[in-house]
């Protein structure tokens, strides 16, 4: 997992046209931030959504020679003190001299010096800097020793998750070595690594390391702006856990973030042990994610079990796509804290109705308007089968309110059923007392006539599944449906002539391909006569139109041929293309007509077995 070297190797490949030992770096436009080029960033030409420009520099350890291409020469080597000058960390060099550290790092030994760049010192709080400069023999020396290890450690030796004792009181240095090649020390990024010295190595870092003696718990307890979070963490028994050893990342909502919550939401969550613990754990990662490690969106699992997406937009960290981090990289002895101005509420702490997204607002508005929201009690468990907004036509919305309420009741189940609990043939009962059938296909899950879209969620008191269409529970059997529709009278008479009517009246699961009367218009009277005269042949043909099992066109993977075996024994080929069902390559005029014992697909030709 030597990611730094892998990324460096990629940068070398990108730079090899420029000569030996040349590395391609990407610099974020308008900043001094430079990164060795990852494959992803190279092609995206951006980092954190900011445009980058490509620079070609000598790879670490090499230098240019006049009149020669690339970087053919090895950089001069010196002791650690001299190397600080070679890498341009002249402020750190000057401070090393002033604090009498120079003698130590010029002499024999083997040291790793995480040397803050000149810019890093300039960015240090002026009061802290003055304090160090006014006590060079103790405070400054201690601060510099806290940037050092008494052993040469190249980036390949700096493994993710290591805690290395520094040369000041063995205070731990948190090492993170990320897959994108970023290496951080207490969240300071190594911006110029592996400058080898005769007595060790120098890594230039982008900030001055401040001493960290406290845990995340200590910080929360001391920080006034986290009093609401502190109270919530105590209530949910999470605070103590943040005092233990670990490599945590805490997204800590400030008091302002808690004030933004709608009235009653926090009270409800904090009054519920399970929900409050979920809320708190959703703000914690079990891995240490420094801001400098984030170069694009990545998904991380929280202690609560669900994931959050951490990304970046310029200098800002984003959480679930939103800029919300006020202060980043507060390093403690068991992790890092980022202060955020929003409370992150996991699904597991939400009421079922709160799980609905922007695409289900019509459904949730109707649930509220028609008085169904009050039926969803916090202590009960429900499942919402929420159709997307565009499933509701103007005709549906202008229906009689009582009728609309009945339709909506068909979209609320009496129990909590998660996506992984659904199975083919399952019967689900709605709060209106209707029974809905579940059909599970290779790439789709459908309930009655409507199939699910991605986005199922589970909340504190229920689950929500997203549907493409309004669910219409079947009322009539296959036979009743054929009788009711005049288009199918010819096929129905053939069914009766073949003595197969009974088959369509009994309970079961069938798929029936029904030719309209038009399908028979082109037939000669002789062909029709043959059909009726030879009962065996007729039965054969009719049974070819019937398949065991309910196969909904919308349940098929688009563009893929599905081979089904008919009751007659021969195969029939179905394919869904552009929302149209093809039956043996013939376009179905109408599909997915649901019945209590199956589904009808309408065709405009009589089908013959091969």
């Amino acid at each position: 997992n030597n990611h730094y070297d892998k990324i460096l190797a990629h940068s070398r490949i990108r730079g090899r046209d420029q000569g030996p030992n040349v590395c391609a770096l990407q610099q974020i436009l308008g900043t001094k931030k430079k990164y060795f080029s990852t494959c992803k960033n190279w092609y995206k030409k951006s980092i954190c959504g900011q445009k980058t420009t490509v620079l070609y520099e000598c790879c670490p350890g090499y230098m240019r020679m006049e009149g020669m291409k690339g970087c053919p020469a090895v950089l001069p080597i010196d002791h650690v003190y001299g190397t600080l000058g070679i890498v341009g960390a002249t402020t750190t060099q000057r401070y090393s001299d002033a604090s009498k550290l120079r003698e130590e790092i010029e002499g024999k030994g083997s040291f790793t010096y995480f040397a803050p760049s000149n810019e890093a010192w300039d960015n240090l709080d002026s009061d802290i800097r003055r304090g160090l400069e006014s006590n060079v023999n103790v405070e400054l020396l201690n601060a510099l020793h806290s940037h050092m290890i008494n052993k040469r450690m190249l980036t390949k030796d700096l493994k993710n998750g290591m805690i290395i004792p520094s040369m000041y009181n063995n205070l731990g240095l948190f090492i993170n070595h990320y897959p994108n090649g970023v290496v951080t020390v207490n969240c300071a990024r190594i911006i110029h690594g592996n400058q080898i010295a005769t007595n060790g190595v120098v890594h230039v870092i982008d900030r001055v390391l401040t001493q960290i003696g406290t845990s995340i718990q200590d910080f929360i307890e001391a920080e006034d702006d986290l009093s609401s979070f502190r109270a919530a963490a105590i209530t949910s028994d999470i605070l103590e856990a943040l005092g233990r050893d670990g490599h945590f990342t805490l997204f800590a909502p400030t008091n302002e973030a808690f004030e933004k919550l709608p009235r009653g939401v926090l009270e409800r969550i904090m009054g519920d042990k399970v929900a409050s613990e979920a809320l708190m754990k959703y703000h914690i990662l079990n891995t240490l994610q420094c801001s400098e490690s984030i170069m694009g969106g990545a998904v991380f699992e929280t202690l609560e079990g669900n994931t959050i997406e951490i990304g970046c937009d310029g200098d800002s960290i984003t959480v679930n796509g939103i800029k919300m981090v006020n202060k980043k990289d507060i390093v403690t002895n068991n992790g890092v804290i980022h202060l955020i101005d929003q409370v992150l509420i996991p699904d597991s702490a939400k009421q079922v109705i709160e799980l609905a997204g922007k695409q289900q607002t019509t459904f949730t508005d109707l649930v509220a308007q028609l008085g169904l929201a009050s039926a969803l009690r916090p202590d009960g468990e429900y499942t919402l089968l929420a159709p997307v907004n565009n499933a509701f036509s103007d005709d549906t919305l202008s229906m009689d309110q009582r009728l609309l309420k009945l339709i909506l009741q068909n979209h609320i189940l009496k129990v909590k059923v998660g996506l992984n609990e659904l199975y083919n043939g399952q019967i689900l009962e709605t709060i209106g007392g209707k029974q809905l059938r579940v059909f599970v296909y290779r790439t789709a899950v459908c309930i009655e006539n409507s199939c699910m879209e991605k986005g199922s969620k589970q909340g504190r008191n229920g689950a929500i599944h997203i549907f493409r269409e309004i669910i219409k529970p079947a009322e009539k059997s296959l036979h009743e449906k054929l009788k009711q529709d005049k288009r199918f009278s010819t096929f129905l008479s053939l069914l009766e002539a073949a003595d197969l009517k009974e088959l369509l009246t009994q309970p079961g699961d069938w798929t029936l391909f029904v030719p309209t009367n038009d399908a028979f218009k082109g037939m000669t009277s002789e062909e029709k006569e043959i059909l009726i005269r030879d009962k065996n042949a007729l039965q054969n043909i009719i049974l070819y139109h019937l398949t065991p099992g309910v196969f909904i066109g919308k349940g098929f993977e688009p563009g893929v041929t599905n081979i089904l075996k008919t009751t007659q024994g021969s195969k029939i080929f179905l394919k869904e293309v552009n929302d149209t069902l093809l039956v043996n390559e013939l376009k179905s005029k109408e599909s997915d007509i649901m019945t209590t014992n199956g589904v009808i697909h309408v065709v405009d030709k009589l089908l013959y077995p091969a």
Epitope: K108, S110, L154
Partner: antibody, heavy 116, light 111 residues
Framework: QVQLQQPGSELVKPGASVKLSCKAS????????MHWVKQSPGQGLEWIGE????????NYNEKFKTKATLTVDKSSSTAYMQLNSLTSEDSAVYYC?????????WGQGTLVTVSA | NIVLTQSPASLAVSLGQRATISCSAS??????????IHWFQQKPGQPPKLLIY???YLESGVPARFSGSGSRTDFTLTIDPVEADDAATYYC?????????FGGGAKLEIK
């Protein structure tokens, strides 16, 4: 100047243990790792392991993990290596070496003889 | 573990002549433009003495007759001209990868 003092020799019986010492002077003991190297009679050199005197952290060569135990006493700036279950194979000169780039400072070595 | 193979195992060189000892590593000992190979001299009854560090840098107090060269896997220690006091065993040593390892040694005899 940097000095690493080791006793000249130790005679030990097979199956017994021995604790070798290495007293450091002339530098800040906790600022440098201490390494131990074995040299069998007429043989080459083998790295045994290292210890960080500031916190007692150790790294061992797999080969010596069960044979050697490294410790330090900061108050006396002394590093120790205990060798257990000694056999004739363990008869050798053992050096302590300060952890510089390139091992610049060596003790004089302790000759351990395992004999009944 | 990185294996260091020294050759020849022993050599006899006339006073004033050049002695060359090779050290071959089983894998590269280079990192960031530096070779983590070091050369020692050892005389009977004494601990090894550092001559050359990081493949080519002369340790302070060591005569300039000693020099080191090479990169990646192939390294050379050269003594030119050889003096009577140079009779000893010479070892190469790598610390690019843990565990650090030593070569088998090359015994130099002065004719």
């Amino acid at each position: 100047q940097v000095q690493l003092q080791q006793p000249g020799s130790e005679l030990v019986k097979p199956g017994a243990s021995v604790k070798l010492s290495c007293k450091a002077s002339g530098y800040t003991f906790t600022s440098y790792w201490m390494h131990w190297v074995k040299q069998s009679p007429g043989q080459g050199l083998e790295w045994i392991g290292e210890i960080n005197p500031s916190n007692g952290r150790t790294n061992y060569n797999e080969k010596f993990k069960t044979k050697a135990t490294l410790t330090v006493d900061k108050s006396s700036s002394t590093a120790y290596m205990q060798l257990n279950s000694l056999t004739s194979e363990d008869s050798a000169v053992y050096y302590c070496v300060r952890g510089d780039e390139g091992f610049a400072y060596w003790g004089q070595g302790t000759l351990v003889t395992v004999s009944a | 573990n990185i294996v260091l193979t020294q050759s020849p195992a022993s050599l006899a060189v006339s006073l004033g002549q050049r002695a060359t000892i090779s050290c071959s590593a089983s894998e590269s000992v280079d990192s960031y433009g530096r070779s983590f190979i070091h050369w020692f001299q050892q005389k009977p009854g004494q601990p090894p003495k550092l001559l050359i560090y990081l493949a080519s840098y002369l340790e302070s107090g060591v005569p300039a007759r000693f020099s080191g060269s090479g990169s990646r896997t192939d390294f050379t220690l050269t003594i030119d001209p050889v003096e009577a006091d140079d009779a000893a065993t010479y070892y190469c040593h790598q610390n690019n990868e843990d565990p650090p390892t030593f070569g088998g040694g090359a015994k130099l005899e002065i004719k």
